[in-house]
């Protein structure tokens, strides 16, 4: 059972039956930090059912205490979480891993981004690395349009100051592994890739470590490529309308298009009693089209003022771009002014100017 991709890998499995007292891990965490203890199976073999124990008492999973067969995670650690932790085989109660955990008042925020990238003793309690802003590291998936720039950050602290390295899909990641290279800022705990391409897709892991432990975070990068398409018109627009003679009417058409769309409003007409030409193409008249000073927003609305019976009929919003055309149509019914207003159909709406 995985506890997510943010891992504090500090435990090591004992290679002998039951660890000697001197083999227990001495670990220091900052208050508010996430404590993660890892206990892989000895020799890499099957582990079987395990239990995690703190100060001799079995740990009960909760929202804050996440228990897995090989890993224990305690979120938002406090002084009360200090103590002796062990991972044991459930059946035999044999101790597989043992940890001594101390939670101190180490700072949990504030990136010293311009600090020296040297592992020096600051005089503060020595301790394993921890994320300086863990609440900022919840998001794991980054989807970016091709040709833009990506930055992954893993700001951390610890004493001695930890080092940071990067993996792509679990392997060491260096500048020569991608065209355009990468830019690293150890003081900002960051990796930058300029002008990303589809081959940059993958899992990127920062590994932050010092002699007291190691933490890691994995991000997934997706690079998006646009496939051009003809305009998309919002469903249900324009809508059928019923209006009273002399009132005003508006038809709306919402157009979505990558390429700049060309929008026209057409009214279907009859020629010699026929609605379509010999080739089946409808007869139409153009009511509104792009001009020097018309905006797309203006073109998405067709306004009819003081409607007459001649305005009744079928109206079409036609949108085209370099890929192709799309169109939606709607009907206008015009009622005499003295008649009761009735809806033309369930989709129509009534405008009484």
């Amino acid at each position: 059972e995985s506890l997510g991709t943010e891992q504090r890998v500090v435990g090591r499995a004992a290679e002998v039956p039951g660890p000697e007292p001197g083999q227990q891990e001495q670990l220091v965490f900052g208050s508010g930090d996430a404590v993660e203890l890892s206990c892989p199976p000895p020799g890499g073999g099957p582990m079987g059912p395990t239990v995690w124990v703190k100060d001799g008492t079995g740990l009960v999973p909760s929202e804050r205490v996440l228990v897995g067969p090989q890993r224990l995670q305690v979120l938002n650690a406090s002084h009360e979480d200090s103590g002796a932790y062990s991972c044991r085989q459930r059946l035999t109660q044999r101790v597989l891993c043992h940890f001594s955990v101390r939670v101190t008042d180490a700072p949990s925020s504030g990136d010293d981004e311009d600090g020296e990238d040297e592992a020096e003793d600051t005089g503060v309690d020595t301790g394993a690395p921890y994320w300086t802003r863990p609440e900022r590291m919840d998001k794991k998936l980054l989807a970016v349009p091709a040709a833009n720039t990506v930055r992954f950050r893993c700001p951390a602290a610890g004493n001695p100051t930890p080092s940071i390295s990067w993996l792509k899909n679990g392997r060491e990641f260096r500048g020569e592994h991608r065209i355009g290279g990468i830019k690293l800022r150890h003081q900002q705990w960051s990796l930058v890739m300029e002008s990303v391409v589809p081959s940059d897709r993958g899992n990127y892991t920062c590994v932050v470590e010092n002699k007291f432990g190691s933490i890691r975070q994995t991000y997934t990068l997706d690079v998006l490529e646009r496939s051009p398409h003809r305009p998309i018109l919002q469903a249900g627009l324009p809508a059928n309308q019923t209006a009273v003679l002399g009132s005003d009417v508006e038809f709306h058409c919402k157009v979505y298009s990558d390429a700049q769309p060309h929008i026209q409003w057409l009214k279907h007409v009859e020629v010699n009693g026929s609605k379509v030409g010999p080739d089946g193409t409808p007869y139409v008249t153009v009511l509104k089209t792009a001009g020097a000073n018309t905006t797309d927003k203006e073109l998405e609305v067709l306004s009819l003022h003081n409607v007459t019976f001649e305005d009744a009929g079928e109206y079409t919003c036609l949108a085209g771009n370099s890929i192709g055309f799309s169109h939606h149509s709607a009907w206008l019914v015009v009622l005499p002014a003295e008649e009761e207003l009735v809806e033309a159909d369930e989709a129509g709406s009534v405008y009484a100017g």
């Epitope: 981004e113 802003r133 900022r136 590291m137 998001k139 794991k140 980054l142 970016v144 349009p145 091709a146 040709a147 833009n148 720039t149 990506v150 930055r151 992954f152 950050r153 700001p155 800022r185 900002q188 930058v192 002008s195 991000y219 646009r226 051009p228 979505y256 298009s257 990558d258």
Partner: antibody, heavy 127, light 107 residues
């Protein structure tokens, strides 16, 4: 080679309209954005607005919101700045610039960087 | 809006000098800061992005540093072509805003 060429500038009366064009070449137009930046004579740079042709999303400076509209025609690799209700204070050299985003999960915004600029076109609003 | 204040507004220097320009934001902009160079009658050119990343093709004598509200552009050894006006610009907040510029003149 990335190139941006602005056109459409000129003299216009207050209250009038003008449409500037920015013809782009040498890069994938739909992946990055186009920003418009202006510079009044002898003054500093002022960001006007930005479009991302991929989804048509636009952003504007408050000083031009409601008067200026940015659009793009990806089939022509061209961006436009439609300027209506022009005022004397809109007099400036207008630059278009290719704009890319720096995407970073650690922060809740996208940093926008303008890396290639056109030569600029002068718009003079005067009666 | 986030105000960007550059200092000094102008400075005189000689070829070979080390020049430092500072930019202060009215609120925290993290590392979302770019530096541009502009010569009279020409379009601006990008030098630095994300506070400290040198844009490709820009000479290594240019460097940027800082985060939060205080930023610095340094030219380690001024060259004749570096006499120009330099602008900082933030894009963490909307709208993007520029500093008023720093003019670097020949002494």
């Amino acid at each position: 080679e990335v190139q941006l060429v602005e056109s459409g500038g000129g003299l216009v009366q207050p209250g009038g309209s003008l449409r500037l064009s920015c013809a782009a070449s040498g890069f994938t137009f739909t992946s990055t954005g186009i920003s418009w930046v202006r510079q009044a004579p002898g003054k500093g740079l002022e960001w006007v607005g930005r479009i991302y042709p991929t989804n048509g999303s636009t952003n504007y400076a408050d000083s031009v919101k409601g008067r200026f509209t940015i659009s793009a025609d990806t089939s022509k690799n061209t961006a436009y700045l439609q300027m209506n209700s022009l005022r004397a204070e809109d007099t400036a050299v207008y630059y278009c610039a290719r704009t890319y985003g720096i995407y970073d999960l650690y922060v809740d915004y996208t940093e926008y960087v303008m890396d290639y600029w056109g030569q600029g076109t002068l718009v003079t609003v005067s009666s | 809006d986030i105000q960007m204040t550059q200092s000094p507004s102008s400075l005189s220097a000689s070829v070979g000098d080390r020049v430092t320009i500072t930019c202060r934001a009215s609120q925290d902009v993290d590392t979302s800061l770019a530096w541009y160079k502009q010569k009279p009658g020409k379009a601006p050119k990008l030098l630095i992005y994300s506070a400290s990343f040198l844009y490709s093709g820009v000479p290594s004598r240019f460097s940027g540093s800082g985060s939060g509200t205080d930023f610095t552009l340094t030219i380690s050894s001024l060259q004749p072509e570096d006499f120009a006006t330099y602008y900082c610009q933030q894009s963490t907040g909307h709208p993007q805003t520029f500093g008023q510029g720093t003019k670097v003149e020949i002494k």
